[in-house]
Amino acid sequence: ALDTNYCFSSTEKNCCVRQLYIDFRKDLGWKWIHEPKGYHANFCLGPCPYIWSLDTQYSKVLALYNQHNPGASAAPCCVPQALEPLPIVYYVGRKPKVEQLSNMIVRSCKCS
Amino acid sequence: ALDTNYCFSSTEKNCCVRQLYIDFRKDLGWKWIHEPKGYHANFCLGPCPYIWSLDTQYSKVLALYNQHNPGASAAPCCVPQALEPLPIVYYVGRKPKVEQLSNMIVRSCKCS
């Protein structure tokens, strides 16, 4: 699987999950989140050659099409597969609130 | 929705489904399929700017991150959303077989 275990410990050039830290205030302009100040969101990057973690029959077909037509603009793309939630704390007035933000952290990628 | 109805009738520059005809023999090297000779597979292409058909909370965050960090390599990607099957006919000896190939035709796209 193109997950953090494999991708973070390798120098994989093809589609893989990459490290990305997002600071809520600086990178998103969200000043109201109290904790955490930011988080390891990660992102997906890298080419999707034929047979590389292809998601559907269609992505297999497209990768094969690409092999026969190397200059074509139609190609599978490296996108998130498994996503995890992130708990945050913010204040409503003086009252702290804990919210679980769904689908915030990329754990693995796929070619789609 | 970034579907064939909208995308094929517009000159949309952002992520949208585009027309692509795949010839089984020429483009995939599949000589064994009897019917059809090829099909309209379509493909997804175009940038994924802020707010453009974002798939998950993560893709919203990434699009917002991109607005604050325009040079970043982390960005949502335009990929298939709705896929449809394709019926094919091939021969096993002299006996024709009909097979439904799942997820073969792109009907709409999303930014993931």
Partner: antibody, heavy 121, light 107 residues
């Protein structure tokens, strides 16, 4: 230029629901909380609640007894306020107002033009 | 809930004079070194507009004839060299405690 443009005036029967829209432009919709405030004829301002559009996270004023529902559509940068079980006491101008951005509850720096809701049998 | 009480309920001021409006909160609205008190003006037939945030900060684009002061429970909005265009209802608002609340207004 930041703009919040609300839907037109509504006339509703008692017991019915009303849904008011607030279409925004000129800023990043997903960066700010959106508040809803109402003003009865000749009266002051009452805060109804707020939504953070990127997640649909909401905080409501208990005064509205669960009758108010706030939603947002990030694809069109539009916020919505639905008020159910309408009664005569709900006759008011309803405003959407953007939060200043430093806190969830905050000052409100941009306001819609207001939507008059009339309840009449 | 924090109750905001404004005085006076209405005020008539001659041009070029100074006007003062008071707002008293039923409990302190100070937290983390800030006073969570803001002031708005609602001109006839218009939506409210933010004048002062966090007790004393002038909102961008607002005339510097407006100034705010105070902390804890007692706050004041001052308008110097009053103009006819300043006519309207002035509201204070706190966001230190949920629910956010407004004063009843000073006309």
């Amino acid at each position: 230029e930041v703009q919040l443009v609300q839907s037109g005036a509504e006339v509703k029967k008692p017991g019915a629901s009303v849904k008011v829209s607030c279409k925004t432009s000129g800023y990043i919709f997903m960066k700010y909380w959106m508040n809803w405030v109402r003003q009865a004829p000749g009266a002051g301002l009452d805060w109804m609640g707020q939504i953070f559009p990127a997640w649909g996270m909401t905080n409501y004023n208990e005064m509205f007894e669960g009758r108010v529902t706030l939603t947002a559509d990030t694809s069109t940068s539009t916020a919505y306020m639905e008020l159910s079980s309408l009664r005569a006491g709900d006759i008011a101008v309803y405003y959407c107002a953007r939060g200043y951005g430093n806190y969830a509850l905050d000052a409100m720096d941009y306001w819609g033009q207001g939507t008059l809701v009339t309840v009449s049998s | 809930d924090i109750v905001m009480t404004q005085t006076p309920p209405s005020l008539s001021v001659s041009p070029r004079e100074t006007a003062s409006i008071s707002c008293r909160a039923s409990e302190s609205v100070d937290s983390y070194g800030n006073s969570f008190m803001h002031w708005y003006l609602q001109k006839p037939g218009q939506s409210p507009q933010l004048l002062i945030y966090l007790a004393s900060n002038l909102e961008s684009g607002v005339s510097d004839r407006f100034s705010g002061s105070g902390s804890g429970t007692d706050f004041t909005l001052r308008i110097s060299r009053v103009e006819a265009n300043d006519t309207g209802v002035y509201y204070c608002q706190q966001n230190d405690e949920d629910p956010l609340s407004f004063g009843q207004g000073t006309k």
